[in-house]
Interface confidence: low
């Protein structure tokens, strides 16, 4: 089951909103044309590990440090950017890091939002992908984020790794995988309604930066945290809806939903379970992808400490991380107990799924995601999981 989780916070909500799992992708284009517009389809799309949270949560949980475009090392434009490793060591980013399947286009956005069109069915691994024997495939996967997915995806992107869920396991043709790196979390009318209350969220703006956080929940895309049920079902993994960096949005809620602890992965660590339960990633030689996490949006404060990222220029920030002399922490750093700390150092697990955190000058935190033969990760914080497995019901 392609257990791909939505990459950015908004991604989840809009991933596979509405295409029947059995239909082939309407368009196998692998360009990242932009977030799909939500649709009111009732198709049962879920991603393994998808949860039922909303995009808002996704943003919150993923501590969605969203804002300006985020970069992927494998996309042109990164060149030999110098990055600071989490430890402070400078590392040169490779000019080009091949994407695992070369299915992703450039991620420098925000791109124009394409009109929503009927999306296609679950994507399959691209040619060259190795498929594990069907016997190793799970019959079902976690649905963690399934309910927070957005509407139908645009042709250029196809469903976000949703996949039919029940029945026998059959590898799909390796030509349908549609790799989408972000979702705008648009509602059925193409507006970012689900992100409306997120700090610095685009609201009803039609041009949103890439964002997505926890079961935000789409919750199913919310994809990132945990849910995936269905009939012609598909689920697709999502990232945590609750990343613990923004608790303010939940202040209305009972403390039951409050995110505790200062680590990005806490009780709401909806990381994007995908693939067969208990099945680890492939054993192939790991490769990786880079994702710059634009530290332009303010992050809510972390319980127990005052941590915040500065908002984009011109945007009001709720928790501007300003230093004693009134200056802000630079990109990729957050104010913590009076000093500016690298998010990479402050949050050891900032990059999910074993990704490596780096700081890129003027860009901010950057995650280098792991990739192996049968499973790889992507998303701003490697919160999305993609596998070569696809279960057909």
């Amino acid at each position: 089951v392609p257990a791909r989780e939505a990459g950015s916070a908004v991604e989840a909500e809009e991933l596979v909103k509405g295409s029947p799992a059995w239909e082939p992708p309407a368009n196998d284009t692998r360009e990242e044309a932009g977030p799909p517009a939500a649709g009111e389809d009732e198709a049962s799309w879920t991603a393994p590990g998808g949860e039922l949270a909303g995009p808002e949560e996704v943003l919150q949980e993923s501590a969605a440090v969203t804002g300006t475009a985020w970069l992927e090392a494998d996309s042109p434009g990164l060149g030999g950017v110098t990055a600071e490793a989490g430890s402070g060591d400078a590392q040169a980013l490779p000019a080009t890091l091949q994407a695992p399947h070369e299915v992703l286009g450039q991620s420098i956005m925000p791109p124009a939002i394409p009109e929503a069109t009927e999306a296609s069915g679950p994507p399959s691994p691209t040619p060259g992908d190795k498929l594990s024997p069907a016997s190793e495939l799970p019959k079902e996967s976690p649905l963690e984020v399934w309910l927070n997915l957005g509407g139908s995806t645009p042709d250029p992107q196809g469903p976000e790794l949703t996949y039919p869920f029940q029945g026998t396991l059959e590898p799909q043709p390796a030509s349908d995988i549609i790799d989408i790196d972000y979702f705008e979390g648009l509602d059925g009318e193409g507006r970012g309604a689900d992100l409306g209350s997120f700090p610095g969220s685009p609201g009803t703006s039609e041009n949103h930066p890439d964002t997505e956080g926890e079961t935000p929940s789409w919750s199913l895309l919310d994809l990132y945290d945990d849910f995936t049920p269905f009939d012609e079902s598909d689920f697709y993994p999502t990232t945590s809806f609750y990343d613990d960096l923004d608790e303010e949005e939940e202040e209305e809620e009972d403390d039951k939903d409050a995110v505790g602890g200062g680590d990005l992965e806490d009780e709401n660590e909806l990381l994007v379970p995908t693939g067969k339960p208990g099945l680890g990633p492939g054993t192939g030689q790991p490769t990786s992808r880079w994702h710059a996490v634009p530290p332009q949006h303010t992050l809510g404060s972390v319980p127990g400490s005052s941590i915040a990222l500065r908002p984009r220029p011109g945007e009001p920030g709720r928790d501007l991380a300003s230093s004693e002399n009134g200056t802000e922490c630079r990109s990729g750093f957050v104010r913590h107990n009076g000093s500016c700390r690298s998010v990479c150092d402050l949050f050891p697990s900032y990059c999910h799924n074993g990704g490596q955190c780096y700081l890129v000058e003027n860009i901010g935190a950057f995650c280098r995601c792991n990739t192996q033969d049968y499973i790889w990760h992507k998303g701003m914080r490697c919160e999305s999981i993609i596998t070569d497995f696809q279960v057909m019901c």
Epitope: G54, S197, D257, P277
Partner: antibody, heavy 118, light 113 residues
């Protein structure tokens, strides 16, 4: 305080229709997926349907697919369950539940009883 | 669908004693990608809606007394009430939250001996 209040239950004949509502308060409704879970008298729990925070994605148990429709109005913080072609086996207390990202139901309404009988 | 089977169907325990409920899933609900078991436990008292006690097999929901604990991984899980209190009399359900449809165990009724 998170509160969920279901309404719309009642007695209906087989083949009839009913629309349940769930008014939510105390949390950012549009940020959470919501579900309907039912419990037949003296029986266990059965997940019925779920909907994403935006309402763009919906999910159903096979037993109700094609007959029930889940929807939500985020402007009214209200969740709905339109039930058509009701059968005797649909008789149950229907609960709306706030759904965590990991798909666990952390808040439940008090439930509304739906009785399908001739 | 993943079938959840609880045992025993009913349990009578003396106040202050330990109560143990088992839950078995027909297939693993453990996801190696995040090492999480997608299993939740609920408590339902007569005339009331269920209440979430545990999720991810062992994480207690906020406000749940620490006498309730969850354990297990893969397909076998256990809910333990370390010292049964009168207010713990209820029916307990396990639920897998890994795949759709979400499914519950048939329930275990806990009473005071």
């Amino acid at each position: 305080e998170v509160q969920l209040l279901e309404s719309g239950g009642g007695l209906v004949q087989p083949g009839g229709s009913l629309r349940l509502s769930c008014a939510a308060s105390g949390f950012t409704f549009s940020s959470y997926a919501m579900s309907w879970v039912r419990q037949a008298p003296g029986k266990g729990l059965e997940w019925v349907s779920a909907i994403s925070g935006s309402g763009g994605s919906t999910y159903y148990a096979d037993s109700v697919k094609g007959r029930f429709t889940i929807s939500r109005d985020n402007s009214k913080n209200t969740l709905y369950l339109q039930m058509n072609s009701l059968r005797a086996e649909d008789t149950a207390v229907y609960y709306c539940a706030k759904t965590k990202p990991n798909n666990a139901f952390d808040y439940w309404g008090q439930g509304t009883l739906v009785t399908v009988s001739s | 669908d993943i079938v959840m089977t609880q045992s025993p169907d009913s349990l009578a325990v003396s106040l202050g004693e330990r109560a143990t409920i088992n839950c078995k899933s027909s297939q693993s609900v453990l996801y190696s990608s995040n090492n999480k078991n997608y299993l939740a436990w609920y408590q339902q008292k007569p005339g009331q809606p269920p209440k979430l006690l545990i999720y991810w097999a062992s994480t207690r929901e906020s406000g749940v007394p620490d006498r309730f604990s969850g354990s297990g991984s893969g397909t076998d899980f256990t809910l333990t009430i370390s010292s049964l209190q009168a207010e713990d009399v209820a029916v307990y359900y396990c639920q897998q939250t890994a795949t759709q449809p979400l499914t519950f165990g048939q329930g275990t009724k806990v009473e005071i001996k």
